[in-house]
């Protein structure tokens, strides 16, 4: 009789994560009597995967019924494969021994490669908001994929970006890999509704890439422009001054009126109007009783937007020494100045 050989017909097997791997092994003889064991890896550090004689291996089933006579098929199935299962698997025949069975012959090994999908890309922007014309960085991360080959692209509103750097780790062999990419984006005033998209393509995704998005509304700060105007007189000795706060984002805004440097009123933007580009407009007005002032009045509209240093715009009301009958239109003149 010819000496037993252990045949592992597949040099390699490729399995998708979550699926079941079949590792084939046959013996060419019933002799010697003794169990089959499966190991991952070789040498003293090898990992026992299945032992016909004893042990509990919940993820492993045998393809054939090993108790049936003449059985020489020792193939196994490993369920719920993960990237951590990748490696070379050896089917090893043991010879019955006393007290312990003795390793008799090993198969040539089957390399199990695991195809694992990348995780959904997570895009994160800068910690603090930035204003238009500034360049900000966005990062995109995806993990747990195998094999290593992967393609990552960046888009802003559907237009592909070119200013980015990507790394796949680790550089050497691993059971699974991670990708990290950083893209630079120049902000414009129109970016409140813009999106940055990170797109990851991998062999496991069958041409249907994964996408992660970041809304620039989380990143951008569009500072307001201020305009202070004097409205027609509503009543004698009264002047209505308005402060137009335009094109700001986000909405968080506090406005303070000062009369000759003294706080007259503070209010928070509430009933704002939204522009098509996603920015907001707001208007505040101040009714000034001219007769209460002997001298010229300097009115200042001071705006603190999104926790930033205040910006202000002033308006000078010149209180006339002439009698009232000159008309309220001439009771005050206005000059404007911008102050920060």
């Amino acid at each position: 009789e010819e000496e037993l050989q252990v045949i592992q017909p597949d040099k390699s097997v490729l399995v998708a994560a979550g699926e079941t791997a079949t590792l084939r092994c046959t013996a060419t003889s019933l002799i010697p009597v003794g169990p089959i064991q499966w190991f991952r890896g070789a040498g003293p550090g090898r990992e026992l995967i299945y032992n016909q004689k004893e042990g509990h291996f919940p993820r492993v089933t045998t393809v054939s019924d090993l108790t049936k006579r003449n059985n020489m098929d020792f193939s196994i199935r490993i369920s719920n494969i993960t990237p951590a299962d990748a490696g070379t698997y050896y089917c090893v025949k043991f010879r019955k021994g006393s007290p312990d069975d003795v390793e008799f012959k090993s198969g040539a090994g089957t390399e199990l490669s695991v195809r694992a999908k990348p995780s959904a890309p997570v895009v994160s922007g800068p910690a603090a908001r930035a204003t238009p014309q500034h360049t900000v960085s966005f990062t995109c991360e995806s993990h747990g994929f195998s094999p290593r080959d992967i393609t990552l692209k960046w888009f802003k509103n559907g237009n592909e970006l070119s200013d980015f750097q990507t790394n796949v780790d680790p550089v050497g062999e691993s059971v699974s890999y991670s990708i990290h990419s950083t893209a630079k984006v120049v902000l414009t005033r129109e970016d409140v509704h813009s999106q940055v998209i990170c797109e990851v393509a991998h062999v496991t995704l069958q041409g249907d890439p994964l996408r992660g998005t970041a809304n620039l509304s989380e990143t951008i700060r569009v500072p307001p422009t201020l305009e202070v105007t004097q409205q027609p007189v509503r009543a004698e000795n009264q002047v209505n001054v308005t402060c137009q706060v335009r094109k700001f984002y986000p909405q968080r805004l506090q406005l303070t009126w000062l009369e000759n440097g003294n706080v007259s009123r503070t209010e928070t933007a509430s009933t704002v109007t939204e522009n098509k580009d996603g920015t907001y407009n707001w208007m505040s007005w101040l009714l000034v009783n001219v007769s209460a002032h002997r001298d010229d009045v300097k009115l200042t509209c001071q705006v603190e937007h999104d926790g930033q240093p205040a910006v202000s715009k002033s308006h000078d009301l010149k209180v006339s020494a002439h009698p009232k009958e000159q008309g309220s239109n001439t009771a005050a003149e206005n000059t404007g100045s911008n102050e920060r």
Epitope: E1, L30, I31, V33, G34, P35, N51, Q52, K53, E54, G55, D65, L66, T67, K68, R69, N70, N71, K96
Partner: antibody, heavy 119, light 110 residues
């Protein structure tokens, strides 16, 4: 180390039944056949039956087919052989034996259980 | 059913001498390229012990003075140099179909 530990000796009256147990250890119980063999005093070996604990498949010697029943309890790795309608010529040592190569052979044996049938 | 007949029923051999026990099957026990014959040794008060499987393969721990041979219907267990501890009853068994045993051969020292 494979071990098969059998239940103790039994004395039974003719017509009664006996159930002998065989507790296995040192291996995965469901992966190997268990055989039952008996030996009357001063006589040779007589094969009774075999059972596959994984699916309870059984094969019986025709002589014992109507009187013997093999069962297993996989939770305790124990095999049982019940013999009914006992006669005096059923007096024997009853052995369980494990088939390590699925060759329908007997690689590891229990120490035997003496069953005496006497009125 | 296949019947196994051993010969002789008993045998006395001097220490150091060769002992030969025969087992004849009523029909061939060869199947799938194997001869489905096994040999056991049973000492008084002990369970049998497997010596030879598939006609010619020594079980683990069995001294190499024990050997099995034969094919088809005729098989032989040979002890090349009898030792005192070899005194026992020897049984052949087939598993070409469901197992049966030979009637046994008692080996003694002359």
């Amino acid at each position: 180390q494979v071990q098969l530990v059998q239940s103790g000796a039994e004395v039974k009256k003719p017509g009664a039944s006996v159930k002998v147990s065989c507790k296995a250890s040192g291996y995965t119980f469901t992966n190997y056949w268990i055989n039952w063999v008996r030996q009357a005093p001063g006589q040779g070996l007589e094969w009774i039956a075999m059972i596959d604990p994984s699916d309870s498949e059984t094969h019986y010697n025709q002589i014992f087919k109507d009187r013997a029943t093999l069962t297993t309890d996989t939770s305790t790795s124990t095999a049982y052989m019940e013999l009914r309608s006992l006669r005096s010529d059923d007096t024997a040592v009853y052995y369980c034996a494990m088939d390590y190569g699925s060759l329908y052979a007997m690689d590891y044996w229990g120490r035997g259980t003496l069953v005496t049938v006497s009125s | 059913d296949i019947v196994l007949t051993q010969s002789p029923d008993s045998l006395a051999v001097s220490l150091g001498e060769r002992a030969t026990i025969n087992c004849r099957a009523s029909q061939s026990v060869r199947s799938s390229g194997y001869n489905w014959i096994f040999w056991y040794q049973q000492k008084p008060g002990q369970p049998p012990k497997l010596l030879i499987y598939l006609a010619s393969n020594r079980d683990s721990g069995v001294p190499d003075r024990f050997s099995g041979s034969g094919s088809g219907t005729d098989f032989t267990l040979t002890i090349s140099s009898l030792q005192a501890e070899d005194v026992a009853v020897y049984y052949c068994q087939h598993s070409r179909e469901l197992p049966t045993f030979g009637q046994g051969t008692k080996l003694e020292i002359k």
